[in-house]
């Protein structure tokens, strides 16, 4: 095998400082020193196959798989991962070796597997195989369950690749809409991995372990219903399994179901049918469309047709990586002290997000609700009318999202005063931010109506407490006012509040608080 090229396979571990996912790249970023992966010729394989040493990677770590080819002339290449081809841009290093790289940023379970690199040089063709797995750390994981067809049986297996081993249960419901809520009497739970009764209205599989509970719903089109409010859309990542169930009921068995993708019938082996008679002797048929590992070309409108029902469609969108789509511009709200109000974020995301609401360094649980139009919404109502900055944070395997909210509570100013030897200061947190007046109380002005304008210094907002602005006003002491009572008043559209201070007192000496509405 004299004319075989000299090949070197290396692993480069990166310092994690980037959250985007790159795929095939010719210029990996700054990193640690490369680790040699060997790349030995695989014996007894058809064609020339090199196999690199197995690569174990920590969750969220970033790596580059790199091949250095010492062969004359140009090379062309193609990466294949989970039946999807990824483009490949070889370049040449200073020693004129061909360099091909695959960058994996923030390693996740879905990015583990076999990466095949096909290289064509002027002399020969060959394949290089990398096997990438996630290092078995003590980190617990909880993965969203997915479905597989049971070999030689009309049944579905629910799988969740989680650590520790999760308890898997099917959650079944036979009525429509609201009555299929988790704790409803219409809901039946079966703690088993295999499900044979696949005719129900709503079928979900849930996996739970110490980290919580994750569920996946069997995506269903029901030809006996009018179409859903929005033409349904199902997102999947490259390599994930696709399952869509089409269900129809008719007075007798004389009808059939078919699946089409963009007007072309699905290939044999990508669907299977089941039928049963219901209690009232009507026939129920279900037809599953499935793809064990989706590629980009599985994107499109899937249409289920019947010889006795109107057809319905769903849009399946295959993405390279997960996403969270929402507007991240910050939002300011102004509410009354007893007004009911909730923050809300509307988003579209895949896979499903984990989220938190944070206020004053304290985190609150986050609930999300799916809307009819493919969006989800998370609301937070538990602000207890505390003004300040509220933060919504969401993340999934591939994306992160943060949105800031400011809550202002309309209220009359409340004044706090303090005095020192040289000045008197008043503070207020009313909203809208108050304006200030200072008045001198004297024999001439026992009602404190003589306004002080000299030596007053207002700061609109001198202190931000978790987003809450505090306004202050300071009066510098002068001989003219020493020994007198002075009154600072804060006023806004909701009222006025005052505090009276004796100016020759050595320490803070609030005297009388007036509340004038």
């Amino acid at each position: 095998n004299q004319d075989l090229p000299v090949i070197k396979c290396v692993l480069i571990n990166h310092k994690n400082n980037d959250s985007s996912v790159g795929k095939s790249s010719s210029y990996p970023m700054v990193s640690e020193s490369p680790e040699d992966l060997g790349c030995a010729l695989r014996p007894q394989s058809s064609g020339t196959v090199y196999e690199a040493a197995a690569v174990e990677v920590d969750v969220s770590a970033s790596i580059t798989l790199q091949v250095l080819v010492d062969a004359p002339g140009n090379i062309s290449c193609l990466w294949v991962f989970k039946h999807s081809s990824l483009n490949c841009q070889p370049h040449f290093d200073l020693q004129n070796r061909g360099v091909v790289s695959m960058v994996i940023l923030k390693m996740t379970e879905t990015q583990a597997g076999e990466y095949l690199l096909f290289i064509q040089s002027e002399a020969t063709n060959y394949t290089i195989l990398f096997t990438v797995s996630i290092r078995n750390t003590l980190l617990y994981t909880l993965r969203r369950p997915y479905f597989r067809k049971m070999e030689n049986q009309d049944a579905l297996v629910c799988i969740s690749e989680s650590v520790p081993e999760p308890i898997v249960e099917w959650v079944l419901c036979d009525s429509q809409g609201e009555s299929c809520k988790e704790e409803s009497p219409a809901v039946v739970k079966k703690e088993e991995k295999v499900l044979h009764e696949l005719f129900g209205t709503d079928i979900r599989c849930c996996a739970r372990n110490e980290l919580g509970r994750e569920c996946t719903r069997l995506f269903t089109i029901d030809l006996n219903q009018t179409p859903q409010t929005t033409l349904p859309q199902l997102f999947l990542k490259v390599g994930e399994p696709l399952w869509i169930r089409c269900k129809a009921v008719h007075v007798n068995h004389g009808f059939g179901l078919t699946w089409e993708l963009e007007n072309k019938a699905l290939e044999e082996g990508n669907y299977f049918e089941m039928s049963t008679y219901s209690t009232n002797r009507t026939m129920i048929r279900i037809l599953f469309a499935f793809v064990s590992s989706v590629a980009r070309n599985d994107t499109g409108y899937y249409t289920c047709s019947s010889s006795k029902h109107p057809s319905q469609s769903a849009l399946v969108t295959i993405v390279e990586k997960g996403f969270i789509n929402a507007t991240n511009s910050s939002e300011d709200y102004e509410i009354d002290q007893y007004e009911e109000f909730c923050f809300s974020v509307r988003f579209k995301a895949y896979p499903q997000i984990r989220c938190t609401w944070t206020f004053s360094r304290k985190s609150f649980p986050c609930e999300q609700k799916g809307l009819d139009n493919g969006y989800s919404i998370s609301k937070f109502c538990n602000h207890k009318h505390q003004p300040g900055e509220y933060i919504f944070h969401a993340e999934n395997d591939d994306a992160q999202f943060t949105k800031m909210f400011t809550l202002n509570i309309r209220r009359k100013p409340q004044v706090l005063a303090e005095a020192s030897a040289s000045q008197a200061s008043c503070f207020s947190d009313g909203y809208p931010l108050p304006s200030w007046t200072w008045k001198k109380c004297s024999d001439k002005s026992p009602n404190c109506t003589e306004e002080i304008t000299e030596g007053v210094w207002n700061r609109k907002a001198n202190r931000k407490v978790f987003g809450q602005w505090v306004s202050s006003s300071t009066l510098n002491m002068s001989e003219a006012i020493k020994g007198f009572l002075v009154k600072c008043c804060a006023y806004n559209s909701l009222g006025t509040s005052c505090e009276t201070i004796l100016l020759n007192s050595p320490g803070p000496f609030p005297f009388i608080q007036d509340n004038i509405s």
Epitope: N224, Q225, T226, T230, L231, Y301, T303, S305, K308, D372
Partner: antibody, heavy 119, light 107 residues
């Protein structure tokens, strides 16, 4: 060929009800949704609702909820649209229209039925 | 509900002219949009579905484009029988909603 034939024009008093029919022929009746769309004189088109002729299930626009009912008779391949508590603003031409699929809506239309509401 | 804004509301053109009508959705509707032609006293007729697919029997001078929120109907060379009112329809979400219509008149 596909044909949707609607019932004739109607004149009704405010508060009354009207029931418009749409008879389908030239295709398998239960295989296609039927929509109802109306058009006030000189105005644009307004979607009213949809019925699944196979099961009879229907859904309506929020604006007409409680006043509109869509039904079907599979033996005669006919769909019906009944509108109650009529008002003068319900004066319009009412069309039935077939859905080829959820991706190709309203591919065949009836000729329209003029409903006039006047005291 | 999704609002469909059609423009212009009317236009005058001559036979042979290239005519463009636009439709904007208040939120993304993917490619789930159809175009209809309506002549006075007649029911609307389907021209384009799924934003750009030409209905069979419709002359090839009609074409549609766009996805998401912005859509266009183009008549490449206006014929005498094309003078009519044109409507867009979104079928992404119920209730289905039509644009306000564009009346194409003879100049």
């Amino acid at each position: 060929q596909v044909q949707l034939v609607q019932s004739g024009a109607e004149v009704k008093k405010p508060g009354a009800s009207v029931k418009v029919s749409c008879k389908a022929s030239g295709y398998t009746f239960t295989n296609y949704y039927m929509h109802w769309v109306r058009q006030a004189p000189g105005q644009g088109l307004e979607w009213m609702g949809i019925i699944n002729p196979s099961s009879g299930s229907a859904s309506y626009t929020q604006k007409l909820q409680g006043r509109v009912t869509m039904t079907r008779d599979t033996s005669t391949s006919t769909v019906y649209m009944e509108l109650s508590s009529l008002r003068s603003e319900d004066t319009a031409v009412y069309y039935c229209a077939r859905d080829r699929s959820t991706l190709v809506p309203l591919d065949y239309w009836g000729q329209g039925t003029l409903v006039t509401v006047s005291s | 509900d999704i609002q469909m804004t059609q423009s212009p509301s009317s236009l005058s053109a001559s036979v042979g002219d290239r005519v463009t009508i636009t439709c904007r959705a208040s939120q993304g509707i993917r490619s789930e949009l159809s175009w209809y032609q309506q002549k006075p006293g007649k029911a609307p007729k389907l021209l384009i579905y799924k934003a750009s697919s030409l209905e069979s029997g419709v002359p090839s001078r009609f074409s549609g484009s766009g996805s998401g929120t912005d859509f266009t109907l183009t008549i490449s060379s206006l014929q005498p029988e094309d003078f009519a009112t044109y409507y867009c329809l979104q079928h992404n979400s119920y209730p289905l909603t039509f644009g306000g219509g564009t009346k194409v008149e003879i100049k």
